[in-house]
């Protein structure tokens, strides 16, 4: 039994190492955002015993704008550091709980399905505002991500359900 792709969370990305039951994955707030204090980036693939269907738990994560980064220009993309994701000091304790992040609060919400990200409507003659955001999924090719502002994603061929051949970059883990 495996989980489908996890829900998208506004202003956050996710790298899924495994879709297996009881797998735990973390969302990472996008560049320019940080985890709101008291919210958790963790999601777990669990089984609904009533329906025998696996699903990801809903993370309480809220990614809020990081005032410290408001006036900084994002780093130009490169093959090593693309997104400039700000690492959050968030780790799992043996109990499975994570420490609260020491960040100011705000009211960004996590979407229950695909996140609706603020952005301008595209018109052929207009340039909308920036504001990079994304969503992701699974069932792709396989690989090892590369280093960004935090540490490398630790992924081996056996650790993921992705078919061989695809490599992520520009993403940082926050375990």
């Amino acid at each position: 039994i495996t989980c489908p792709p996890p829900m998208s969370v506004e202003h956050a990305d996710i790298w899924v190492k495994s879709y297996s039951l009881y797998s735990r994955e973390r969302y990472i707030c996008n560049s320019g955002f940080k985890r709101k204090a008291g919210t958790s980036s963790l999601t777990e693939c669990v089984l609904n015993k009533a329906t025998n269907v696996a699903h990801w738990t809903t993370p309480s994560l809220k990614c809020i704008r990081d005032p410290a980064l408001v006036h900084q220009r994002p780093a130009p993309p490169s093959t090593v550091t693309t997104a400039g994701v700000t690492p959050q000091p968030e780790s799992l304790s043996p109990s499975g709980k994570e420490p609260a992040a020491s960040s100011p609060s705000s009211n960004n919400t996590a979407a229950t399905t695909a996140a609706i990200v603020p952005g301008s409507q595209l018109m052929p003659s207009k340039s909308p505002s920036t504001g990079t955001t994304e969503i992701s999924s699974h069932e792709s090719s396989h690989g090892t991500p590369s280093q960004t502002t935090a540490k490398n994603w630790e992924l081996t061929a056996s650790a993921s359900h992705q078919p061989p051949g695809v490599y992520p970059q520009g993403h940082s883990d926050t375990t």
């Epitope: 990305d13 695909a114 301008s120 994304e134 969503i135 992701s136 999924s137 992520p168």
Partner: nanobody
Framework: EVQLVESGGGLVQAGGSLRLSCAAS????????MGWFRQAPGKEREFVAR???????YYAESVKGRFTISRDNAKNTVWLQMNSLKPEDTAAYYC????????????????????WGQGTQVTVSS
């Protein structure tokens, strides 16, 4: 509805470089993950690279270290910089937009993409 228009394809010698562009209109560009796929004659369409709404990137093993995907939400454009091209890179290259899974870095099935461009041909001669 999002319209995607690719450009930048052409004929290049092995070892050369090309930069493909994909211009989007008709939707909220920053709400999509963008991907590049390619299809050689007689072969299935295959994943090349993906950039999430958070600008995180993901590459097929066959292009890792040679191709770079990037996006500019202000210009509603995604690029694919292709260096050290090989004859086996010859294919029609397609740009695609994925809204539902815009924040998923390593999710690349063709079925997750909502919109596709018409493609641009890249031919690498030996």
């Amino acid at each position: 509805e999002v319209q995607l228009v690719e450009s930048g394809g052409g004929l290049v010698q092995a070892g050369g470089s090309l930069r493909l562009s994909c211009a989007a209109s008709g939707g909220t560009f920053s709400s999509y993950a963008m991907g590049w796929f390619r299809q050689a004659p007689g072969k299935e369409r295959e994943f090349v690279a993906r950039v999430t709404w958070g600008a995180n990137t993901y590459y097929a093993e066959s292009v890792k270290g040679r191709f770079t995907i990037s996006r500019d939400n202000a210009k509603n454009t995604v690029w694919l910089q292709m260096n050290s091209l090989k004859p086996e890179d010859t294919a029609a290259y397609y740009c695609a937009a994925d809204r539902k899974y815009a924040g998923h870095i390593n999710y690349t099935p063709l079925t997750s993409y909502d919109y596709w461009g018409q493609g641009t041909q890249v031919t690498v001669s030996s």
